[in-house]
Structure formats: C-alpha cells, structure tokens
Amino acid sequence: AVNGTSQFTCFYNSRANISCVWSQDGALQDTSCQVHAWPDRRRWNQTCELLPVSQASWACNLILGAPDSQKLTTVDIVTLRVLCREGVRWRVMAIQDFKPFENLRLMAPISLQVVHVETHRCNISWEISQASHYFERHLEFEARTLSPGHTWEEAPLLTLKQKQEWICLETLTPDTQYEFQVRVKPLQGEFTTWSPWSQPLAFRTKPAALGKDT
C-alpha cells in the first residue's frame, strides 16, 4: 500500500459527499494534489482539489451529486487515491479501498430552535441533514449545554440512544443565558464517527416570577 509517512482519512456523509483529509510529513513543494474516487460498481468517478488546512495537511470534499441523492450503498467500495502532480504526471501518494457505510460522519444537525422555555427548563428541537433513509431510526445523539463561566469542554454530555430530534433540558437557572449544541452518529460502521457539533443555539431562561417559582 502506498502510505509512506502520510495519513489519508475519509468519511461519507451517507448521501452525496465524501470528505477527505490527507496529512504528509515533510513539506511538499508547491504542487497540485487531488483526491480521485473510483467506485467499483458505478459509472461515475469524481475528483476534488486538495487545499491546505495546515502546514502538512490538506482537505477536500468529493461532491457526488445533489445533496440529498443516495449515491452509494452498503455494498459499494470506492477506491480513493491521493494524486500529486510531478512534472506532467500524477503520482499516487496514498490509496485506500473505502467502504462508505463503514466510514460514516453525518452532517451537523441543523434548524435548532427553542420549542418552549421556562425558568428552569427548555425544550429544544433540531433536524438531521442529508442523512440516508437506510438508517431508519438507527441513530444516536449527543448534546451539551454551555453554562455561564464554563467552556464547551467542561459541559457534560447528554446521550440520546435513539433517533430523538428534541430534548428537554432540566434544572436550569432562571434568567440565564445558555448555549446548546447537538451532534449525531449512525450506529452502523466500524470507523463511523460523530458528526461535527451543530451551530450553537443561544437561549435565555425566563426570570423567576416574584414570590413564586414556575
């Protein structure tokens, strides 16, 4: 296998996007590199230009079709190659036989909104984006709430072990500003990982009513 001192990691968003990151020890000269995708049972192939994300790391997104189109299935294997320009030719820098449904990372949940807020609790809902219908209900979520004076890293994780696109946050402090994030993961796939965290949703609990607690 072509590896050398490089690392080539890709994830499928379950619909029409494969995102890849390639890391290479030792600086490359100003050269053009690409990821090529060749499915074993499809008529199409796809290419994306690797762009630097750090001194020794490059990334790109293989757009396989319309965002909600189901471009790959559990039986597909896609040969992914990193090719870099040398002279007039391309050199294979890294290669992997990619099983899309073993390497899943969904898009971050979207459309977060406060359904109902009180002094001590808040009900929040969200939607999943570009997730395959193959999963049916086989998804799990993690959520976290940012309290004043704390960091996201300190926030305790709330786990939802089923496809539940809402949460009721309890024991909140009245009249306090919070932020909330959620992420999603399919149960399927040996190398499947959590989606990125959603954009934070800011909300404020209601102030306590004078003389009584609602």
Epitope: V2, N3, S6, V88, V92, M93
Partner: antibody, heavy 121, light 112 residues
Framework: EVQLVQSGAEVKKPGASVKVSCKAS????????ISWVRQATGQGLEWMGE????????YYNEMFKGRVTMTRDTSISTAYMELSSLRSEDTAVYYC??????????????WGQGTTVTVSS | DVVMTQSPLSLPVTLGQPASISCRSS???????????LEWFQQRPGQSPRLLIY???NRFSGVPDRFSGSGSGTDFTLKISRVEAEDVGVYYC?????????FGGGTKVEIK
Amino acid sequence: EVQLVQSGAEVKKPGASVKVSCKASGYTFTDYVISWVRQATGQGLEWMGEIYPGDANTYYNEMFKGRVTMTRDTSISTAYMELSSLRSEDTAVYYCARGSYTYDNYAMDFWGQGTTVTVSS
Amino acid sequence: DVVMTQSPLSLPVTLGQPASISCRSSQNIVHSNGNTYLEWFQQRPGQSPRLLIYKVSNRFSGVPDRFSGSGSGTDFTLKISRVEAEDVGVYYCFQGSHIPWTFGGGTKVEIK
C-alpha cells in the same frame, strides 16, 4: 500492439535546430505521456523531459531548458521533440518512450527505435 | 540531481552462470509516498532499451524469471540466475523517485 515509430536520421550544423517525430499506434495517444531520452555515442541514457498529449503540458529537464521544445499533434498521434542551438555534444540517438499518465509503477514501458542526430560542421 | 552509479562497468560471464550488477544512488530514492521507483532496463546491441524490473523487484510482463531485482534505500542489485546468449547487452538502472529522473552509466554484460 503498441508501437512508437520515429523519424529518420538527421545531420545538422552547429547552431541549427532539429525536430524529431514519434508516431504512436496501438493505444490511445492522449492517455499516456511521451518521454524523450537521449544516448550520446558510447554513453549512457539521459532523460530530457516529457509531454502529456492530452493537454500538451510539458516538463523539461533543467539541463535542456531553453533549448528543447516538445509538442504534439493529436490528429495524427504524433509527438515532436525540437532541440535548438545544436552543438557537437548533442550528437546522439534520441528515443521517445511511452509512460503512464499516473506514475504508479514505472516511468517508461515502450520505446521507439531511436533517431540518430549528428551535429557536424 | 540524483547520481546513479553502476558497477562493474563491464561484466564477462559464462553461459549458464549467474551474474550480478550493482547500482548505488547518491541519495535515498524512497519516494515520499513510501515507494522506491528503481527500475532496470536492458539494451541489446543495436536495439532500444527494454524495461525489465520496476519498483526494485517487480518483473515487467514478458520478462523471464531468471531476472530479479533487490535492494533498498541507496543500494540495489540486478541478478541474472543463469545467463543466456540473448542476455548480452548493456543494463541500466534508473530512478523515478526524484525529478529529474536519472539513469546509471550502464553495465555491459558479455559472454566470456
């Protein structure tokens, strides 16, 4: 059957230019690179550079930059190598060779028969 | 540029006997992708070069199994297990790891 057929021998005066052709058959011309390699009499092999006929992109060995020009005519599946400001040291056999556009395994698999270029006053 | 040095310059051999050619590169020719693009070419008298071995030890299609390649880093060897009359010619090593690609000076194999 892959074949690369080169033009005939040339005799040139110092300071002149020579243009060697290489006609490809037996494969899709625009799918492979054409490399040029020269061999001075009784000497070893020297890689001069190459052209990708698909987009006419070229890469020249620094040693020949400014004097060598590689071109192609896809309509007749032919690659050309022109060397200018000839000197006696350019007397050599010039080979074209086919190479994969993606260098996975080897640089050159099939070679032309060679064209002898003699530079003499 | 990577300088490829071959030895010996000339190699007289007896038919049916083994032969060994050495090739040394002036710097490591492991490509940054982890592969070593060391190739061997044979040039019979009056003919064009012919690819024998690629990536150190892989025989090109149609090449007899009496030819084998080995080595790593900067030191490489081409072996002919039992020399036949048709093996007479000049053998060149070649590195395709670092542009400009370069050839060794050649080793002439002749029959004693």
